[in-house]
């Protein structure tokens, strides 16, 4: 007779999950000398810890500290990249200007990144039918609670001047609901973070509105004003020249406005 | 190989404050959590808090907040741990420690720290 | 805060003897558990690390077991120099806490 699962509004565990993440936390610390003493077992166990046997509508930050501990690794706390609905640009500007890192650039980003993971309630298995949705189901599942986790103490690391790329073809450029918005302006420190400098990336070829004039982008600075940040703003009216310029910055079109 | 090798001894007046150090060697410095812990006689060990040196992170155990502050420079890779407001409980040795899967590989000589009068 | 509750505080064995010192925390802790031995004068020197691991230098007499809540830390082959005071520690969530202790002395 099959047990009775709880059916959930998520996709379920992304296939081979533990693999995956071993494989993921192997290749990084080959790829990153200062992470080589990183023992992957222990990190799987720990990650595995986090979500394995609870409820995964009842997760905390406290069930991933000991995968926080034992991620933990020295970013240069200047050269931090955030992002908000624009991811792709965002590793592609990193992958080229490679001493700037977002969250995924960082061990425990990598290892999670576009990965979904949960289990269930006093059974040692994982859940690869489906996992709780943020919000269909519950905010508090092992994805959601895992990525705010690491952001919190992503941002929580920043200082001097901290660049976040947002998205400009978006209805809500800021949104105060991203994981940006929610979870990672609320963390910068103020007396360690000087500035929040935002680039507003353009989407359509022919757009040449003034897009940090956009009122959520507004909110923006209102908010990080309050917390004593200052801000900035700067639109990227041209994605594509702009990685090629980050690519190859001694090319005469460069000078000009991207 | 690993060590970690600790400040003398201190004789304090109550109300008054101490810094310790904790200096590492045979290892990197930045890689590693710096854990503290105090010990007294009859008290068992009571982990204080640490340190990530390489990030600044620094981690509390609620009865030392207020108590204990931690700071580490990487140019010398020393750890420091200052305690304030000095009474007769904080009489104690003090141990640095390096962390390691989550326990604590290797251990200071300890920094004995007597609070009188 | 987990509390680790470790039995016996202490214990009197003959040498030669397999002796278990036994720990149990108050929630799960994987096995984020640690056994340190410290000697009368000397500073904690840490035997097994997640739960079953022997650190390097120790002696293979030394074995922990245990995952969840229940640990053990096992002495096979009693020795003199195996005086001393025995302690656990979890690693699972903040704050980091210490069993109480077992003092071991030869018969």
């Known amino acids: 007779v099959p047990r009775w699962r709880q059916q959930w509004s998520g996709p379920g565990t992304t296939k081979r999950f533990p693999e995956t993440v071993l494989a993921r936390c192997v290749k990084y610390t080959e790829i990153h000398p200062e992470m080589r003493h990183v023992d992957c077992q222990s990190v799987w166990d720990a990650f595995k810890g986090a979500f394995i046997s609870k409820h995964p509508c009842n997760i905390t930050e406290e069930d991933y500290q000991p995968l926080m501990k034992l991620g933990t690794q020295t970013v240069p706390c200047n050269k931090i990249l955030l992002w908000s609905r624009i991811k792709d640009l965002a590793h592609q500007f990193t992958q080229v200007q490679r001493d700037m890192f977002t969250l995924e650039d960082t061990l425990l980003g990598y290892l999670a990144d576009d990965l979904t993971w949960c289990g269930e309630f006093n059974t040692s298995k994982i859940n690869y039918q489906s996992c709780p949705d943020w919000r269909k189901d519950c905010s508090n599942n092992p994805v959601s609670v895992f990525w705010k986790t690491v952001s919190r103490r992503f941002a929580e690391a920043a200082c001097d001047v901290v660049h976040v790329m947002l998205n400009g073809s978006r209805s809500k450029i800021f949104d105060k609901n991203s994981t940006f918005g929610s979870v990672e302006v609320h963390n910068l420190q103020p007396e360690k973070v000087q500035t929040l400098e935002a680039w507003v990336i353009h989407g359509g070829r022919e757009d040449s509105r003034d897009l940090c004039q956009d009122p959520t982008i507004k909110e923006l600075e209102s908010i990080i004003s309050k917390r004593n940040i200052q801000f900035s703003c700067k639109n990227i009216y041209r994605p594509d020249k702009f990685l090629q310029c980050v690519k190859n910055p001694e090319d005469s079109s460069c000078t000009s406005e991207i | 190989q690993v060590q970690l090798q600790q400040s003398g001894a201190e004789l304090v007046r109550p109300g008054t404050s101490v810094k310790m150090s904790c200096k590492a060697a045979g290892y990197t410095f930045t890689n590693h959590w710096i854990e503290w812990v105090k010990q007294r006689p009859g008290h068992g060990l009571e982990w204080i808090g640490d340190i990530f040196p390489g990030g600044g992170y620094t981690d509390y155990n609620e009865k030392f907040k207020g108590k204990a502050t931690l700071t580490a420079d990487t140019s010398s890779s020393t750890a420091y741990m200052q305690l304030s407001s000095l009474t007769s409980e904080d009489s104690a040795i003090y141990y640095c420690a390096r962390g390691r899967d989550l326990a604590m590989d290797y251990w200071g000589q300890g920094t004995s720290v007597t609070v009188s009068s | 805060d987990i509390q680790m509750n470790q039995s016996p505080s202490s214990l009197s064995a003959s040498l030669g003897d397999t002796i278990t010192i036994t720990c149990h925390a108050s929630q799960n802790i994987n096995v984020w558990l640690g056994w340190y031995q410290q000697k009368p004068g000397n500073i904690p020197k840490l035997l097994i690390y997640?739960?079953?691991n022997l650190h390097t230098g120790v002696p293979s007499r030394f074995s922990g077991s245990g995952s969840g809540t229940g640990f053990t830390l096992t002495i096979s082959s009693l020795q003199p120099e195996d005086i001393a005071t025995y302690y656990c520690q979890q690693g699972q969530s903040y704050p980091y806490t210490f069993g109480g202790g077992t003092k071991l002395e030869i018969k």
């Open positions: 997640k739960a079953s």
